[in-house]
């Protein structure tokens, strides 16, 4: 006899990286007929939704209207059908950004390189942080962690055209509190035809929406975002 229901799916809209004082929605998708959803934050009950009518709803939304460092951390959700509870969802790491200062991102030998050349990014922030994160716009899984007193090195090694794209970095005050994003650095690799359209193998943020980390929220893509957001979050842990 089944003792628990399948785990629900959890994700954040518009994104798991939330600028401070901005709104974010945590979505939890379970099964039709679920009479109760619970959202847990850092292991404690945070919110409860009992959708009506339950047979017509399989997703609930928990709003956080004003993101701050107290609300940043690990969230999970569960749901109940009758008396039977689900397994807990994967952990969602909610990160608050735009904290304190703005790092500087530079690239050596330069932003235009030849395929096969060794490239290193440098992220510098003069305030009290020792962890840095380099993100390539596009797939959220392109996150690298680096350490240093005021600067971290991110060696990419010999680059290929797959490394092309726009990079930003953050200083991290803890796993869930990040600085403002750096100004973007666009890496061009010889042979690359500049293309700003969404490529299926590497979906990208439109350049003008990066500042607020907006993602397209078409229903069909929400799960995909959560999947690759989750990959990025694994790097945070």
């Amino acid at each position: 006899q089944q003792q628990t229901l399948p785990k629900p799916f959890i994700w954040a809209e518009p994104h798991f990286m939330v600028p401070k004082e901005k709104q974010v929605t945590i979505c939890c998708q379970g099964n039709y007929g679920a009479v109760e959803y619970q959202l847990h934050f850092e292991g404690s009950l945070f919110a409860v939704d009992r959708p009506k009518p339950p047979e017509r709803i399989n997703k609930v939304q928990f709003y956080i209207p004003d993101m701050n460092s107290r609300m940043a951390g690990q969230y999970s959700c569960i749901y109940r059908v009758g008396e039977l509870w689900s397994e807990p969802s994967n952990l969602l790491d909610l990160v608050v950004t735009e904290m304190y200062d703005t790092p500087t991102l530079s690239v050596h030998p330069g932003p235009e390189v030849i395929s096969g050349e060794k490239v290193t990014f440098y992220c510098r922030l003069d305030t009290a942080t020792s962890m840095f994160l380099l993100l390539k716009e596009g797939r959220s899984s392109h996150v690298q962690r680096g350490y240093g007193k005021v600067q971290a090195e991110f060696p990419l090694g010999p680059v290929t055209t797959a490394h092309r794209g726009t990079y930003r970095c953050f200083g991290s005050y803890n796993n869930h509190a990040w600085s403002f994003p750096s100004e973007p650095v666009k890496l061009l690799v010889t042979g690359d035809i500049e293309n700003t359209s969404l490529a299926p193998e590497d979906p990208t943020f439109p350049a003008d929406t990066w500042g607020t980390y907006l993602l397209t929220t078409e229903t069909g893509l929400q799960k995909d975002h959560a999947l690759w957001d989750h990959t990025a979050q694994n790097l945070l842990r």
Partner: nanobody, 130 residues
Amino acid sequence: EVQLVESGGGLVQPGGSLRLSCAASGRTFSRLPMAWFRQAPGKDREFVAAISWSGGSTYYADSMKGRFTISRDNSKNTAYLQMNSLRAEDTAVYYCAAVGDSAPYSATIVYTDARAYAYWGQGTLVTVSS
């Protein structure tokens, strides 16, 4: 901006009842989930009960279930906490709280964590003693 003012606290004997009120100012009150919390001397703040903006969903801390009832009257911009079968351990300052007012909350959602609440009253003291 929402302002909250609690009333109805006082001294009551064990087994007695009290009804706390939380009057809110601000046009958005009727769309905000609310809750009651309490803090006993020398202890951490503790969740008591929560209610959705519609009043259709409620949630209680286990130790209050069956004894306390949370309700609201949006036409009066007021929330209530009816407390029955009071015990000495219910002695505390009781606070009402409302969430931030910039989001379209589900009519059935309640928040149980103090960190979710942006607006707080000044509290009303409930003393249960013979």
